[in-house]
């Protein structure tokens, strides 16, 4: 015999009080799934979390957090603290990166610079602390006389034929 | 062992005042967001307010917005709660409660130590 609550659809639920009829979720309520028994009560994004989704008869609200943190954990569960680039988040607070690593994000940990050598190539651009190394054409390839690398065009303003 | 021990508590008159105190020790005070939760009689337990490790974020419930203040003093591990205009409804036993990982603040849920809590009322 086929139970009758699993004709119940998401957003309701089946209500034993009224002969399993199946009756919509109140407010502040939702299922996710037909066949429910109970409707879950939503999630209230309060404090430093900020409601991303509200929360409908068939699903759950969703929430971030606020400027200055970020969200940690299945579903935003928590809201880590940011730090500025070129830092990361210790045990004794927000740090700057040690020289020679970096970091371009609010968020995560200091990463060291590209080795551009292992590739055989120069650095172009030094890294700081926010930003990694710039990698450019193999030392090889910057000798005098090396004729492989082919010099850039001059630049032109869009317009203008050259002279 | 980590320990929250409040204070202040006490009856009150509507349209008053009181100050909470929670000190703690057991663990390194300054790395760990902090929390006021609150418990009215015959009621769930209902988040008041969060202060984040630093001291320079603070969130507050709608209904307590305007009239309490989250403060704390981490060379004196200690947690307040300043609560002015005081009504009848904010009776309740109010518990601090320490968030679990440092510089992160989490939901009620996932708070990993709590006070004994303090009574406060509010009552003519």
């Known amino acids: 015999l086929q139970d009758p609550c699993s004709n119940c659809p998401a957003g309701t639920f089946c209500d034993n009080n009224r002969n399993q009829i199946c009756s919509p979720c109140p407010p502040n309520s939702f299922s996710s799934a037909g066949g429910q028994r109970t409707c879950d009560i939503c999630r209230q994004c309060k404090g430093v979390f900020r409601t991303r989704k509200e929360c409908s008869s068939t699903s759950n609200a969703e929430c971030d957090c606020t400027p200055g943190f970020h969200c940690l954990g299945a579903g935003c569960s928590m809201c880590e603290q940011d730090c500025k680039q070129g830092q990361e988040l210790t045990k004794k607070g927000c740090k700057d990166c040690c020289f020679g690593t970096f970091n371009d994000q609010k968020r995560g940990i200091c990463r060291p610079w590209t080795n551009c050598s292992l590739d055989g190539k120069s650095v172009l651009v030094n890294g700081t602390k926010e930003r990694d190394v710039v990698c450019g054409p193999s030392p090889a390839d910057l000798s005098p006389g090396a004729s492989s690398v082919t010099p850039p065009a001059p630049a032109r303003e869009p317009g203008h034929s050259p002279q | 062992q980590v320990q929250l021990v409040e204070s202040g508590g006490g009856l009150v008159q509507p349209g008053g005042s009181l100050r909470l105190s929670c000190s703690a020790s057991?663990?390194?005070?300054?790395?760990?967001?902090m929390s006021w939760v609150r418990q009215a009689p015959g009621k769930g337990l209902e988040w008041v307010s969060d202060i984040n490790s630093g001291g320079e974020s603070t969130f507050y419930e709608d209904s307590v917005k305007g009239r309490f203040t989250i403060s704390r003093d981490n060379a004196k591990n200690t947690l307040y709660l300043q609560m002015n205009s005081l009504k009848p409804e904010d009776t309740a036993v109010y518990y601090c409660?320490?968030?679990?990982?440092?510089?992160?603040?989490?939901?009620?849920?996932?708070?990993?130590?709590w006070g004994q809590g303090t009574l406060v009322t509010v009552s003519s």
């Open positions: 409660a320490k968030h679990p990982l440092t510089f992160t603040i989490a939901t009620m849920n996932d708070y990993d130590y």
């Open positions: 057991g663990f390194t005070f300054s790395s760990y967001a």
